[in-house]
């Protein structure tokens, strides 16, 4: 594109197009391009203490075309500016400066903060935080059994990271003390970190009450000591029912 | 705030002459290359004429050349339309605006009525 | 000169509705067409230049396409402030011209 830049020709005469190189309809010897071919884009280079026109299918870095009637002219983009549309609107600030609105700015205004990536006055953004997802079930030592007073927890995610600027994010998590009706350890459940293990949905009132299964046991057959703590947990569904977890919330 | 305000706009017979001005602010005049851009009246839009930054060559469309004069005083901030043998052609919303490719910012416009 | 020719002249319809006004060249102009609004009494803005840049501040659901002699404005979920005159520019060549505008009205 920039091929012709800067090159003297050889024998070039005023105003005659003859010998003329790079896109030159006309061209002198001291001057270089007096005037371009169709569509393309005549730019003066300062080259030592003169000046050298040349003709370029598109403008240099730092230059926007605008083509007249008479003549296509690289116009130079705003000092700050790297790359233009025109005067108005600069598309890529030079170094150190933020792009706003087609401006380059030093600073960005009160309200914006500097992306320093792509060097752009950006909107603050806040740090968003979903829903609270329902409490964990009581527990202790990661186990659901064989204890009275326990903790819970409930976690929320990071829906959107705030900006350099933003509010920062508030916890995403929160335990509380938790009590509830003491149960045995069923054989087979003893140490089961109650996480590990896929539970049964708990009915009413039953939340704080890890409902053992079968799966995860060594034997998928049901034995009758089995059986019988089935039975068991049926008779004290009345009871559990009754039965309100108390609750202390603390925020870790 | 770039602002562009026209005035000289009014009634006018066939054949008189009629000159707006255009007061800029808010932005380096000097810089820019300025325009006339007028609308007839439930009409589209029509560029007229355009002056270069420092004045040195100015540009019309043929319905106004040897008519119509552009001007401009950058130590005034003003662009001047000195419009002469006016046709009922003529007669529309004039706009001043800046003319870098697009017309970026624009006056509130003036209206001229060429009328017997 | 070039010839600018949008189509439809007008447009009927709904908030919410996705709109697309369609400018033709005469000839070849590249990229260099640009979108403008126009309401009753003001003066028009420009939206878009090189086809499809969004001045700063133009809400997002605007968009410009197309090359050489063909393009397109879509407006892609229509809000009662849009209802106006649009207007297509090209800076190709001199006379920069217009296109007649399509005046895009409420149903």
């Known amino acids: 594109q920039n091929a012709s830049r800067g090159r003297r020709q050889r024998r070039m005469h005023p105003n005659v197009s003859q010998g003329c190189q790079g896109g030159c309809a006309t061209c002198s010897d001291y001057n270089g391009c007096l005037s371009c071919k169709p569509r393309l884009f005549f730019v003066l280079e300062r080259i030592g203490m003169k000046q050298i026109g040349v003709c370029l299918s598109s403008c240099p870095s730092g230059y926007y075309g605008t083509r007249y009637p008479d003549i296509n002219k690289c116009t130079k983009c705003k000092a700050d500016c790297d790359t233009c549309f025109n005067k108005n609107f600069c598309t890529k600030c030079k170094s150190g400066f933020y792009l706003h609105l087609g401006k380059c700015l030093d600073n960005c205004p009160e309200g914006l903060e500097a992306n320093n990536h792509t060097m752009e006055c950006v909107n603050i953004v806040h740090c968003e935080v979903s829903e609270w997802n329902p409490w964990s079930p009581c527990t202790k030592k990661g186990k659901t059994c064989g204890f009275k007073r326990g903790t819970e927890t409930r976690v929320r995610e990071i829906m959107q990271h705030p900006s350099a600027k933003g509010n920062l994010c508030p916890p995403t998590n929160e335990t509380r003390k938790c009590t509830v009706q003491r149960k045995k350890c069923q054989k087979g459940e003893r140490g089961k970190k109650g996480r590990e293990r896929k539970r049964k949905k708990p009915n009413k009132g039953e939340s704080k009450e890890a409902i053992p299964d079968s799966k995860g046991l060594e034997s998928s057959k049901e034995t009758p000591e089995q059986r019988e703590n089935k039975q068991q947990q049926k008779k004290r569904k009345v009871q559990d029912k009754q039965q309100k977890s108390v609750s202390v919330s603390t925020v870790h | 705030e770039v602002q562009l305000v026209e005035s000289g706009g009014g009634v006018v017979q066939p054949g008189r002459s009629l000159r707006l001005s255009c007061a800029a602010s808010?932005?380096?005049?000097?810089?820019?290359?300025m325009a006339w851009v007028r609308q007839a009246p439930g009409k589209g839009l029509e560029w007229v004429a355009t002056i270069i930054y420092d004045g040195s060559r100015t540009y019309y469309r043929d319905s106004v050349k040897g008519r119509f004069t552009i001007s401009r005083d950058n130590s005034k901030n003003t662009l001047y339309l000195q419009m002469n043998s006016l046709r009922a052609e003529d007669t529309a919303v004039y706009y001043c605006a800046t003319h870098d490719k697009t017309f970026d910012y624009w006056g509130q416009g003036t209206m001229v009525t060429v009328s017997s | 000169d070039i010839q600018l020719t949008q189509s439809p002249s007008s447009l009927s319809a709904s908030v919410g509705d996705r709109v697309t006004i369609t400018c033709r060249a005469s000839?070849?102009?590249?990229?260099?067409l640009a979108w403008y609004q126009q309401k009753p009494g003001k003066a028009p803005k420009l939206l878009i230049y090189?086809?499809?840049s969004l001045i700063h501040g133009v809400p997002s659901r605007f968009s410009g396409s197309g090359s050489g002699t063909d393009f397109t404005l879509t407006i892609s979920s229509l809000q009662p402030e849009d209802f106006a005159t649009y207007y297509c520019q090209q800076y190709d060549n001199y006379p920069n011209t217009f296109g007649q505008g399509t005046k895009l009205e409420i149903k």
């Open positions: 808010g932005f380096t005049f000097s810089d820019y290359d």
């Open positions: 000839e070849d102009i590249y990229s260099d």
């Open positions: 090189d086809v499809n």
